[in-house]
């Protein structure tokens, strides 16, 4: 019979960063393989990752169709070597995932400082806009395109010679900050969605970039450093 020795998947977990979304589960299969289905609350089930021995399934292509929808997935367990049979009416064991709303729950990926430029006592710091797999009219959208003003960046900056940090915020991808002339500064940024009230409202901090280390250009000194 079709489901002998098969066990339901468990620990179904959504792993999602910048809308790249993978469903993971346990256990590593022994006598079984898995098929995943996903749907919106009002939609039909769509099958993905047919008869896989993996314990994960990339569902990005489905959730990017509407990142503000709420999705539910389920993982079915079939006997290893299973070939779908029209005669089988026995439903295989399955487990439902938690609900997942990409716009509210995808983690913000680590941002990158694209460049900084010093003019006198001002420094312009630019954050790289990350591309996502969300599309509009066959064009991939950036993180800023998707979140708009819901997404802000926090800049942490400090003199290379001290540890006292200052902060600035922007709802664009650029900061313009005042600095002391003749001092080198270090920078790190963090992406934030202030409207979120959960642990995923902030990204991890970007790598630290410091003046005089390849990332920016200074009109003070005439040295030009280009971002690779």
């Amino acid at each position: 019979s079709g489901t002998t020795n098969t066990v339901a998947a468990y620990n179904l977990t959504w792993k999602s960063t910048n809308f790249k979304t993978i469903l993971e589960w346990e256990p590593k299969p022994i006598n079984q393989v898995y098929t995943v289905q996903i749907s919106t609350k009002s939609g039909d089930w769509k099958s993905k990752c047919f008869y896989t021995a993996d314990t994960e399934c990339d569902l990005t292509d489905e959730i990017v169709k509407d990142v503000k929808q709420t999705y539910l997935a389920r993982v079915f367990s079939y006997p290893a070597g299973h070939v779908e049979s029209t005669g089988s009416t026995e439903e295989p064991p399955y487990e439902n995932s938690p609900e997942f709303t990409p716009y509210l729950e995808t983690n913000l990926g680590q941002p990158t400082i694209q460049s900084f430029e010093q003019v006198g006592t001002k420094v312009n710091v630019t954050v790289q806009d990350e591309w996502t797999l969300v599309r509009r009219n066959d064009t991939f959208l950036s993180l800023r395109d998707v979140f708009g003003k819901d997404l802000i960046y926090t800049l942490y900056y400090w003199k290379s010679s001290s540890s006292g940090k200052k902060t600035a915020k922007t709802n664009t991808n650029e900061f313009l900050i005042d600095v002391d002339k003749g001092e080198n500064y270090c920078f790190s940024v963090q992406a934030v969605i202030p409207s979120r009230r959960t642990a995923n409202r902030k990204s991890t901090d970007s790598p630290v970039e410091c003046m005089g280390h390849e990332k920016g250009e200074s009109r003070e000194t005439g040295h030009h450093h280009h971002h690779h």
Epitope: I22, K28, I30, N31, A53, D54, E56
Partner: antibody, heavy 125, light 108 residues
């Protein structure tokens, strides 16, 4: 045949981050296996740290989870271990290994069939 | 966490003798997840047995594995000089994957 080679600093200062890389040669890291890190304290047994699938999904030992990050670079056929806030208790030989799912006669079997030679990491100031 | 307890801790035997090593799990482990490894000083572990009873490629037939559930056994039918080493059982089914504490097989 597939070979694994660990690389990274042999000496790390307390509170710093231990970083090791495992390079896969003679095969592809994207070939459907899991890739693990294991360590062995001096004169002691083996401790599994965590594993990564080529797609980037990870499983970690809960006892180390708060300090461990394992990542993969499929373009270089490498996977890496970062262990933060190290202490002398993290002094060990660190091994990378391939965890293979093997399908036979209607079922899957799992085992670590290829190991690196190991690299000794000492945590000391 | 599944605790694997190996016994004895040390086994003192002569070449040609039979070695029987035990691995007991704190909860049931599918045989598909149970493996045995051999480790010599200064070397990485080497896979001997997977699936509780299947020999890995290139492993001599004097090594055999058996058992199911919570009790597993590695048997070396006739010890050769190169077999004196430490042997570990391991389960790779339930996170965290765990190893037994090892059994040292030494020359008597």
């Amino acid at each position: 045949q597939v070979q694994l080679q660990e690389s990274g600093p042999g000496l790390v200062k307390p509170s710093q981050t231990l970083s090791l890389t495992c390079t896969v040669s003679g095969g592809s890291i994207s070939s459907g296996q899991y890739w693990s890190w294991i360590r062995q304290h001096p004169g002691k047994g083996l401790e599994w740290i965590g594993e990564i699938y080529y797609s980037g999904s990870t499983r970690y030992n809960p006892s180390l989870k708060s300090r461990v990050t394992i990542s993969v670079d499929t373009s270089k056929d490498q996977f890496s271990l970062k262990l933060s806030s190290v202490t002398a208790a993290d002094t060990a030989v660190y091994y990378c290994a391939r965890d293979t799912p093997y399908y036979y006669d209607g079922g899957y079997y799992y085992y670590m069939d290829v190991w690196g030679k190991g690299t000794t990491v000492t945590v000391s100031s | 966490e599944i605790v694997l307890t190996q016994s004895p801790g040390t086994l003192s035997l002569s070449p040609g003798e039979r070695a029987t090593l035990s691995c007991r799990a704190s909860q049931s482990v599918s045989s598909s997840y149970l493996a045995w490894y051999q480790q010599k000083p200064g070397q990485a572990p080497r896979l001997l047995i997977y699936g509780a009873s299947s020999r890995a490629t290139g492993i001599p037939d004097r090594f055999s594995g058996s058992g199911s559930g919570t009790d597993f056994t590695l048997t070396i039918s006739r010890l050769e000089p190169e077999d004196f080493a430490v042997y570990y059982c391991q389960q790779v089914g339930v996170v965290p994957y765990t190893f037994g504490g090892g059994t040292k097989v030494e020359i008597k």
